[in-house]
């Protein structure tokens, strides 16, 4: 019906038992598209379909989806198709998010909070990891302390920072004057006895095309780690850029077009023009991947009514290496904290 | 059948803040953009505010826009509207109604929000 | 914003007379795919309003077939090929192409 989120309801009629096992095709060449692109209700975005054929409107969180009728990938939601099988022809979609984690061999579902060990506490969020410390003990007065130690406490799980560099005054823990460290507006952002922790963003979902990036922050009221998205796009799919690649090269590591143009986003344009880096591609091997980035607002306008703003990927530079590990590894950013070791092995 | 059944009006000094609330049923409320409407008395109908079918988009009229907050608990079938720094001229009857893409199908009985000192 | 300006504003009718509608909107109501999202609405005194006609001249279920709608791109009519006693009220045009939704003023209809 024309008021549900998908305007053109999809009745899936399931097979006959005998042909369970056969998948029905969903796409059909050459395309067959209506003359007008559908109008898609509020907060739905308009997009090709799977066949990549015709303008349709996205099924959202709890649609069925086909390969031809595919979930909106704008919120992050995937054709879950567990429940079909074998055919695997008719799925829901499903968000992205709600996946388990792994960690050291043990598995952790998602939301699921645990401590690897007395010094951290990590909670599963849509297969990430993100952990925050439970050591808070502040850095060491600046204001007198010159030498400062951190000494391990018998006894207790977490280090204690000592000073003893300054004769006129006695040995004592950081902890005791956190009131000298204060004044000197030194103070580590907090919430609560809470560290501030932002995991990296997330590898773009597509090689190609919109994709979206995520990350796992707890900067907010609560600390709570929450998901945080931005959209992405690595290199556009229409472009072969092997064929930017110069001559005797094997690699072009940045393609960037020669126009300025508008990004699109579900039919809505970007108020102003951008002339995007994409990261290229190789002949060989390697992969490219950006390694010179940050997160930019982009603002939309719609033609039928106000716009919107959507955080999204900027490259500044790429690199091409063999290393095509997938980088969605929250724990090379720990490495920076005291004793990673214990948490990472 | 479906239902939209509002509660929340009543009379207020300009300046203060008023909640109102739209409990929906006979339908899947989580999958339908919802929105307000009003009709100062003896006057015609001012459409209002509306919020997408899980809230992640709003639109709202130029009279109402930084005072006006529209929002909805889709599990609890409800649709709210907060009404801050409340003017004389916000009195009105509002009615919450259901969109219909391109249309409103479904409009509630109305609560009155007179705004007096 | 998109304007729509309704006439007559009052609009006397004998019963079993016809009555017409003009509603005129400042920009064009083609929707990009294809269609025109106008709507008529009437409003009984001391009641919500409802849904008449959509998509400029679809008529709701339970609406009486006296009821019709019709025009394009800018100039829309509501007709009514009988009225009767019970139509007494206000009818409203409104657009749902662009946003906001906009409302005509309002036409009342009264029985002579």
């Known amino acids: 019906t024309a008021l549900s989120p998908t305007p053109t309801t999809m009745t899936f009629t399931p097979a006959p038992l005998e042909e369970t096992t056969t998948r029905p095709e969903f796409c059909k060449w050459p395309c067959e598209c209506p003359q007008s692109p559908p109008r898609c209700p509020l907060g739905v975005s308009l997009i090709t379909d799977g066949c990549e054929c015709c303008k349709i409107c996205a099924q959202q969180l709890g649609d069925n989806c086909t390969e031809a009728a595919i979930c909106d990938p704008h919120r992050g939601l995937y054709c879950d198709y567990s429940g079909d099988r074998p055919r695997y022809a008719i799925g829901v979609c499903a968000q992205v998010v709600g996946v388990g984690c792994v960690l050291d061999g043990v598995r952790y579902t998602n939301g699921e909070s645990f401590q690897p060990n007395c010094r951290y506490n990590c909670t599963c969020i849509d297969g990430t990891v993100g952990c925050t410390p439970l050591c808070l003990s502040p850095r060491p007065p600046r204001l007198w302390c010159r030498q400062p130690r951190h000494v391990r406490v018998p006894g207790q799980c977490c280090e204690q920072w000592v000073c003893d560099d300054d004769a006129r005054r006695p040995r004592q823990t950081a902890l005791l004057d956190t009131r000298a460290f204060a004044a000197s507006g030194a103070v580590e952002q907090r919430y609560e006895n809470c560290i501030a922790y932002t995991s990296p963003w997330s590898p773009c979902s597509t090689t190609c095309g919109l994709g979206i990036s995520t990350r796992i922050s707890n900067v907010n009221a609560r600390c709570w780690p929450e998901q945080e998205s931005r959209l992405c796009n690595l290199r556009p799919c229409d472009v072969d850029i092997q064929l930017h690649i110069k001559a005797g090269k094997k690699c072009l590591a940045v393609y960037q077009p020669e126009e300025a143009t508008n990004f699109t986003l579900a039919g809505c344009v970007s108020t102003r023009t951008y002339r995007p880096k994409y990261c290229g591609v190789c002949t060989d091997n390697r992969c490219c991947i950006p390694y010179k980035s940050k997160t930019i607002s982009v603002d939309f306008q719609c033609p039928e009514g106000p716009g919107f703003s959507r955080q999204v990927l900027w490259i500044n530079a790429c690199f091409c290496n063999l290393s095509c590990r997938n980088p969605n590894d929250i724990f090379a950013d720990l490495e920076s904290y005291p004793d990673f070791e214990e948490i990472a092995n | 059948q479906v239902q939209l059944v509002e509660s929340g009006g009543g009379v207020v000094q300009p300046g203060r803040s008023l909640r109102l609330s739209c409990g929906a049923s006979?339908?899947?409320?989580?999958?339908?953009?919802m929105h307000w409407v009003r009709q100062a008395p003896g006057k015609g109908l001012e459409w209002v505010t509306v919020?997408?079918?899980?809230?992640?988009?709003?639109y709202y009229a130029d009279s109402v826009k930084g005072r006006f907050t529209i929002s909805r608990d889709n599990s609890k079938n409800t649709l709210y509207l907060q009404m801050n720094s409340l003017r004389v001229d916000d009195t009105a009857v509002y009615f919450c109604?259901?969109?219909?893409?391109?249309?409103?199908?479904?409009w509630g009985q109305g609560t009155l929000v007179t705004v007096s000192s | 914003d998109v304007v729509m300006t309704q006439s007559p504003l009052s609009l006397p009718v004998t019963i079993g007379q016809p009555a017409s509608i003009s509603c005129r909107s400042s920009q064009g109501l083609v929707y990009s795919d294809g269609n025109t999202y106008l709507n008529w609405f009437q409003q009984r005194p001391g009641q919500s309003p409802r849904r008449l006609i959509y998509k400029v001249s679809n008529r709701d279920s339970g609406v009486p077939d006296r009821f019709s709608g019709s025009g394009s791109g800018t100039d829309f009519t509501l007709k009514i090929s009988r009225v009767e006693a019970e139509d007494v009220g206000v009818y409203y045009c409104?657009?749902?192409?662009?946003?906001?939704?906009?409302f005509g003023q309002g036409t009342k209809l009264e029985i002579k």
């Open positions: 409104m657009q749902g192409t662009h946003w906001p939704y906009t």
């Open positions: 006979g339908f899947t409320f989580s999958r339908f953009a």
């Open positions: 109604a259901r969109d219909a893409l391109g249309s409103i199908d479904y």
């Open positions: 919020t997408s079918f899980d809230g992640s988009e709003i």
